[in-house]
Interface confidence: low
């Protein structure tokens, strides 16, 4: 008799990443009988929600339901109806909501309450919406990339199945850049983690990991730009801000009220004799870099060594995956290749920032001007953060791998979050069975 395929025994999970600038929904899928195996979960869909991040809905919470509809309906289509009720849905909000919570816990709670109420109306197994900590964001990003790279697998392989694989079980560090925060997470080499707040202990697949992590709130690319503008307008002689981080010929009017809306600019706030000012781009990488460095306080360190702002950072160790905005920005600038040295990246940034705005607009006609205008700042900021902030050097630059996806799944905290919340990363090594369940009879 002919072999007949049994119905696919798979499970699904949904995670919404409620970031500061936008929300993305990820759908994951895995074979039901292999839940504890490493590397079996993969992403089948990403849906980017149209509109800003959820923290921007604080004055219009009634619009959140409509905002989430398209992507939740997409999930309804992708996941078979028979699986809906057992598919967990998690929403994790990151630094945009951490900032809102700093301003008002009540407002943050109201936003989350409406989000929870909206998501509860779908036929999935809604598990809650919460603001994840910076420490969790770093930890889950680290878990995600190492899970996808096969670093937790039982056996070392003599062949490579994924890019960036170094054929050993040394984990990769994780560098995550968002709009409002940035995370650095890695296993230091025989180094005491001097600050308990930055120490994580994991037991995964029978192995112990002592992991360093820190999340720098206000040092995501968007909030760093607001910080820089607030700092620079303090010393402007009038309502014109000649800014080296924008292309020559670029002009934009900024409301002072918008500048001081975020808690990230509070330290630079002052009474200005104008309600608006105009940014006028002058496109100078070196000056832009110098201005950015003023955001990092490196004069104070209560530990053996620090990143900046008095935050402990052990000596860098091993390879790093740099993802989220680290990847998107460098990809746009065509600087993600492993072959491009740090010196070459700097050289190319100098040329890019110096290009006139009109020329840039013509060259990248399909890109929204809001985003296009900020690539000079973002690229310079990435270099400043990695080199001066985290102490990468021209030599260690080659250990940074700019990663968008690994094996078809986005690098980021969402997969690690789901793996943890669905108990799919066992602390102990699962007992291996001689044969997996056959899918054919």
């Amino acid at each position: 008799t002919q072999n007949k395929a049994l119905p696919e025994n798979v499970k699904y999970g949904i995670v919404l990443d409620a970031g500061s600038s936008h929300t993305s929904l990820y759908i994951y899928k895995w074979p039901a009988e292999k839940e504890n195996d490493t590397g079996v979960v993969h992403q089948v869909e990403e849906c980017r929600v149209k509109g800003p991040g959820i923290s921007k809905f604080v004055q219009k919470v009634n619009e959140i339901g409509i905002y989430l509809t398209d992507c939740m309906e997409r999930a309804r289509e992708v996941i078979p109806r028979s699986q809906h009720q057992e598919t967990p849905v998690y929403l994790g909000a990151t630094a945009g909501m951490r900032l809102l919570r700093m301003e008002s816990e009540e407002l943050a709670d109201r936003v989350l309450d409406v989000v929870e109420r909206s998501l509860s109306n779908y036929p999935f197994d809604f598990q809650g919406a919460r603001i994840i900590t910076g420490q969790e964001e770093g930890a889950y990003g680290w878990i995600t990339i190492n899970y996808l790279l096969g670093k937790f697998s039982q056996k070392t392989r003599w062949f490579s199945i994924v890019p960036y694989e170094t054929n050993n079980q040394e984990t990769f560090g994780a560098l995550d850049l968002g709009g409002a925060s940035t995370q650095v997470t890695f296993v230091p080499q025989n180094q005491t983690i001097e600050s308990p707040d930055n120490a994580l202990q994991f037991r995964l697949y029978g192995k112990d990991y002592n992991v360093y992590t820190h999340s720098f709130l206000c040092y995501g690319k968007d909030q760093a730009l607001w910080q820089k503008l607030a700092k620079d307008i303090q010393v402007a002689s009038n309502e014109i801000l000649r800014d080296p981080c924008f292309h020559p010929g670029y002009k934009k009017v900024v409301n002072v009220s918008d500048l001081y809306k975020t808690p990230c600019t509070k330290r630079f706030e002052m009474t200005l004799p104008f309600q608006q000012f105009e940014i006028q781009g002058i496109g100078n990488y070196q000056q832009c870099h110098q201005s950015i460095l003023e955001l990092f306080n490196t004069s104070y360190c209560p530990y053996s060594q620090c990143a900046f702002n008095g935050i402990f950072l052990p000596p860098l160790q091993g390879d790093f995956g740099a993802f989220s905005a680290f990847y998107f920005v460098m990809k746009f600038l065509n600087l993600t290749s492993e072959k491009v040295s740090q010196e070459k990246v700097t050289e190319m940034m100098k040329k890019f920032c110096a290009q006139p705005w009109e020329e840039i607009k013509t060259s990248y006609a399909g890109v929204k001007e809001k985003y296009l205008s900020e690539y000079c700042f973002s690229g310079t900021y990435i270099l400043s953060l990695l080199l001066q902030g985290y102490h990468f050097t021209a030599d260690s630059w080659e250990h940074i791998h700019f990663i968008g996806k690994i094996q078809g799944s986005d690098a980021g905290w969402t997969l690690g979050y789901m793996l943890n919340l669905t108990n799919m990363i066992p602390a102990e090594q699962p007992l291996s069975t001689p044969l997996s369940h056959s899918t054919y009879v």
């Epitope: 998690y90 929870e116 809650g128 919460r130 994580l200 037991r203 943890n420 919340l421 990363i425 066992p426």
Partner: nanobody, 124 residues
């Protein structure tokens, strides 16, 4: 219905240690997040520490970081709170709670099931 029973409280001098246990009536306890809260006289119930279902990530209140450690033994359906370097301000009634929703770990309303509490008194 998960029933939780705390034990291990008592009177201890400042600088001393205690280990609280929270035993659950149900075998599916390892599917729940576990939190410890404390309530001092005249004060609201306050978050102390939580552990996620898999035990991979733990969360601590700033006031206990580096002094308290949460762990769990799934085989025994028990969660533990090891409290070192105790201070008089740690004096409170300590509650264990189970969270089936993996959300809102830091506030009491995120938890579905509660124990009756065990008293911890730290004398100076």
């Amino acid at each position: 219905q998960v029933k939780l029973q705390e034990s291990g409280g008592g009177l201890v001098q400042a600088g001393g240690s205690l280990r609280l246990s929270c035993t659950a009536s149900e075998e599916s306890f390892n599917k729940y997040g576990v939190g410890w809260f404390r309530q001092a006289p005249g004060k609201e119930r306050a978050f102390v520490v939580a552990i996620r279902p898999s035990g991979v990530i733990t969360s601590y209140a700033d006031s206990v970081k580096g002094r308290f450690t949460i762990s769990r033994d799934s085989a025994k359906n028990t969660a533990y709170l090891q409290m070192n370097s105790l201070k008089p301000e740690d004096t409170a009634l300590y509650y264990c709670a189970a969270n089936s929703r993996n959300t809102n770990y830091y506030r009491p309303n995120g938890y579905d099931y509660w124990g009756r509490g065990t008293q911890v008194t730290v004398s100076s």
